[in-house]
């Protein structure tokens, strides 16, 4: 999916009300010096793509976010505010409902978590390089 | 817990350059911008400047550029800015910020650092 | 640059009262809008995030409102530790511009 026509403004509102409380909530007794992140996004499309591949694309270690608040929280912002975005879900949400396992919260997946926080941040205030 | 902590008040010539640091600790260095502050004695807030210590990218207000040069040491996790050609309206109190973990505002900053510029 | 500008520049008011501060904005923020208190000889404090969101920490009669241009920060029932300064900033783009401020004085 191309998120380059979203509507970003309404996305970060989004994330700053609700969506980012679910993430810290979720991070809840994490030393706030344990990850560095090492995933990085240069724009917001660019963000939105490494977010929703982060949040949603089960990863070896972590293969439950999708059904976290946070998750069904930044589907909805998603679903509201791309164009388009939910059509394109519909194969993917079908695929991971057979694939569906039981929520652990491993160090893997406060790992993916951090990386999303970090996302999220560059999502919000993208430092462009200065000319 | 997450602390910024600026170096000490300096009083030097027109003319100079001096170098204020900002040495983080409690969070991961790299994660955050680090955001630079000018406020002159009885006035406001003014924006100066931005660092990614990740990266070492920069921005800097038109007003201050040529004038502020930000760096970051990833070993020590300390942010610097140096400031060249020194005058009387450079003499302010200057402080460091890092920025949220939501990316949306600043939410720690440093003591602040008072540069007196006098011959 | 975006230019933000704050009003009143100063205004008196008792304990117990409560009292608005605006922000306007020279072109449309959306809700990217950050508010800070400053007391003398301090660092300044976050206050308000996004317009509306309260920060870690901040009482409950601190409130953010306002989109595009035109904000306000309202402190209602003030109490001794209110009085100081308060600043608006745009989060916007960079550039960020602070707003002018506003000095809280007990009357």
């Known amino acids: 999916y191309d998120f380059t026509n979203c509507d970003f403004e309404k996305i970060k509102a989004a994330y700053l009300s609700t969506i980012s409380k679910d993430l810290i909530t979720y991070m809840s007794g994490t030393k706030s010096t344990e990850f560095n992140n090492t995933v990085s996004c240069s724009n917001r499309p660019h963000c939105l793509t490494e977010i929703q591949s982060l949040t949603f694309n089960p990863t070896a270690g972590c293969a439950s976010l999708a059904k976290e608040m946070f998750a069904m929280k930044t589907k909805a912002a998603l679903a509201i505010w791309c164009p388009g975005y939910s059509e394109t879900q519909i194969n993917a949400t079908q695929a991971m409902k057979k694939r569906r396992k039981r929520k652990v919260t491993t160090n893997k997946c406060l790992e993916q978590v951090s990386q999303l926080q970090g996302l999220w941040r560059r999502f919000n205030r993208p430092l462009l390089k200065q000319q | 817990q997450v602390q910024l902590q600026q170096s000490g008040a300096e009083l030097v010539r027109p003319g100079t350059s001096v170098k204020v640091s900002c040495k983080a600790s409690?969070?991961?260095?790299?994660?955050?911008?680090i955001e630079w502050v000018k406020q002159r004695p009885g006035q406001g807030l003014e924006w100066i400047g931005v660092i990614n210590p990740e990266s070492g990218d920069t921005y800097y207000s038109e007003k201050f550029k040529g004038k502020a040069t930000l760096t970051a040491d990833k070993s020590s996790s300390t942010a610097y800015m140096q400031l060249s050609s020194l005058t009387s309206e450079d003499s302010a109190v200057y402080f460091c910020?890092?920025?949220?973990?939501?990316?949306?505002?600043?939410?720690?900053w440093g003591q602040g650092t008072t540069l007196t510029v006098s011959s | 640059d975006i230019q933000m500008t704050q009003s009143p520049a100063s205004l008196s008011a008792s304990v117990g009262e409560s009292v608005t501060i605006t922000c306007r904005a020279s072109e449309n923020i959306y809700s990217n809008l950050v508010w800070y208190q400053q007391k003398q000889g301090k660092s300044p404090q976050l206050l308000v995030y996004?317009?509306?969101n309260l920060a870690d920490g901040v009482p409950s009669r601190f409130s953010g409102s306002g989109s595009g241009t035109q904000f306000s920060l309202k402190i209602n029932s003030l109490q001794p530790e209110d009085f100081g300064n308060y600043y608006c900033q745009h989060f916007y783009e960079t550039p960020l511009t602070f707003g002018t401020g506003t000095k809280l004085e007990i009357k």
């Open positions: 910020a890092k920025e949220s973990l939501t990316g949306s505002s600043y939410d720690y």
């Open positions: 996004g317009a509306r």
């Open positions: 409690g969070y991961a260095f790299t994660n955050y911008l």
